[in-house]
């Protein structure tokens, strides 16, 4: 078979949820491999995912060093086999990613209702404080640790017997709501960062209903 040209990567896309961050690109390589480099605006280019035939690279370890920084990545295409490099003067081809600021852009993962507890006509609903891959002093921070009061949760709740939904909001991970005595309620929560312009809301949590295992009832 004849020689082919090395082709530059394209469609570089950041996929990030709760700071787990992967750069994806195309095309699937033929007679070429990729190496990814990542940098902050003021920093040096650090090579990652060396000589790979994958079309994705996990950059979580780099971006969690400072989630408020803005990052840029680039994907180099290196000839590997019966190919000619189309870069000039022996320089490999590369393509830049869009800029990515984890704090402003990482998707909020689907939250989970950890528990709910009824005391009389009050129900306390607790949202699981999900662990991220962001570290401080060698321990992993939770979503609340990272976002603080920038993160709120919206609770949707309704009587099992009807479809009319009510909402409540909290800037902690707990809700205390009033309910009608003797009625069973269902709950779903959503994570929200109101100050954001993109990726403001998570998907809704799975629905949890009273009378199921997660709940506790006290007179």
């Amino acid at each position: 078979s004849g020689t082919t040209n090395t082709v530059a990567a394209y469609n570089l896309t950041w996929k990030s949820t709760n700071f787990k961050t992967i750069l994806e690109w195309e095309p699937k390589p033929v007679n070429q491999v990729y190496t990814v480099q990542i940098s902050t605006k003021s920093g040096d280019w650090k090579s990652k995912c060396f000589y790979t035939t994958d079309t994705e690279c996990d950059l979580t370890d780099e971006i969690v060093k400072d989630v408020k920084q803005t990052y840029l990545a680039r994907v180099f295409s290196y000839p590997a086999g019966n190919v000619e490099s189309t870069g000039s003067a022996g320089e490999p081809l590369y393509e830049n990613s869009p800029e990515f600021t984890p704090y402003l852009e990482t998707n909020l993962g689907q939250p989970t209702i950890q528990s709910f507890e009824q005391v009389g006509t009050k129900v306390n609903v607790t949202v699981e404080d999900e662990r991220t891959l962001v570290r401080r002093n060698n321990t992993f921070l939770s979503l609340r640790d990272v976002f603080g009061k920038d993160l709120i949760y919206t609770l949707y709740y309704w009587k099992s017997s009807s479809s009319g939904k009510k909402t409540a909001k909290t800037n902690t991970n707990e809700f205390l709501i009033d309910v009608d005595k003797g009625e069973n309620y269902c709950f779903s929560v959503q994570a929200v960062i109101p100050s954001r312009t993109v990726n403001r809301k998570s998907t809704d949590s799975p629905v949890e209903c009273m009378g199921q295992e997660k709940g506790e009832f006290r007179e």
Partner: antibody, heavy 117, light 106 residues
């Protein structure tokens, strides 16, 4: 021009430790991964691992994970390889080499480490 | 780890003869380099990315292969080519080298 200059020969007793240095010049030291490779007398090449000077991230060959430590001193643009609990089989020439793509190829001159009682 | 097996270990060849060195990998490799090393010298990159000649390498050298089988070929051996040649894979960590092939001039 890029240069990697390594420390001089070492004679060590079994069980001792050795620390080999590799001083880089002619480029931004913190921006390139630095490899360490060794070659026993009359034998082939063996990759020990590599370190990224800017943040000291290391990739280590599992064979050496309990006995080799890679480190850097950014202030003097120097990379270090320390091997502890030396054995006769660690007698080798140890090379540092800048990680580069393609024709770029920069190696230190090698440091001979002899382990003998 | 990926084990690279070179053959032959040693080759004694007359000038202008063709030399073929093979490197067989224990599992599939997508990025293979070849190094040349002369006595008391550091290794030098000779072929990178399976088939690309490093700068200054004469065109009588070539590299080929894919998957688990790779070849370095010297089309017409010259005296200056006497050296040991090593293959190296950079497809998965730990990066590994072949055992080397020593090429001697008859």
């Amino acid at each position: 021009q890029v240069q990697l200059v390594q420390s001089g020969s070492e004679l060590k007793k079994p069980g001792a430790s050795v620390k080999v240095s590799c001083k880089a010049s002619g480029y931004s030291f913190i921006s390139y991964w630095m490899n360490w490779v060794r070659q026993a007398p009359g034998q082939g090449l063996e990759w020990i691992g590599m370190i990224y000077p800017a943040d000291s991230e290391t990739r280590l060959n599992q064979k050496f994970k309990d006995r080799a430590v890679l480190s850097v001193d950014k202030s003097v643009s120097t990379a270090y390889l320390q091997i502890c609990s030396l054995k006769a089989e660690d007698t080798a020439v140890y090379y540092c080499a800048r990680e580069d793509y393609g024709s770029s190829d920069y190696w230190g001159q090698g440091t001979t480490v002899t382990v003998s009682s | 780890e990926i084990v690279l097996t070179q053959s032959p270990d040693f080759q004694s060849v007359t000038p202008k003869e063709k030399v073929t060195i093979t490197c067989s990998a224990s599992s599939s490799v997508s990025y293979m380099n070849w190094y040349q090393q002369k006595p008391d010298q550091s290794p030098k990159i000779w072929i990178y990315g399976i088939s690309n000649l490093a700068s200054g390498v004469p065109s009588r050298f070539s590299g080929s292969g894919s998957g688990t089988d790779f070849t370095l070929t010297i089309n017409s051996l010259e005296a200056e080519d006497a050296a040991t040649y090593y293959c190296q894979q950079k497809s998965s960590f730990p990066w590994t080298f072949g055992g080397g092939t020593k090429v001697e001039i008859k």
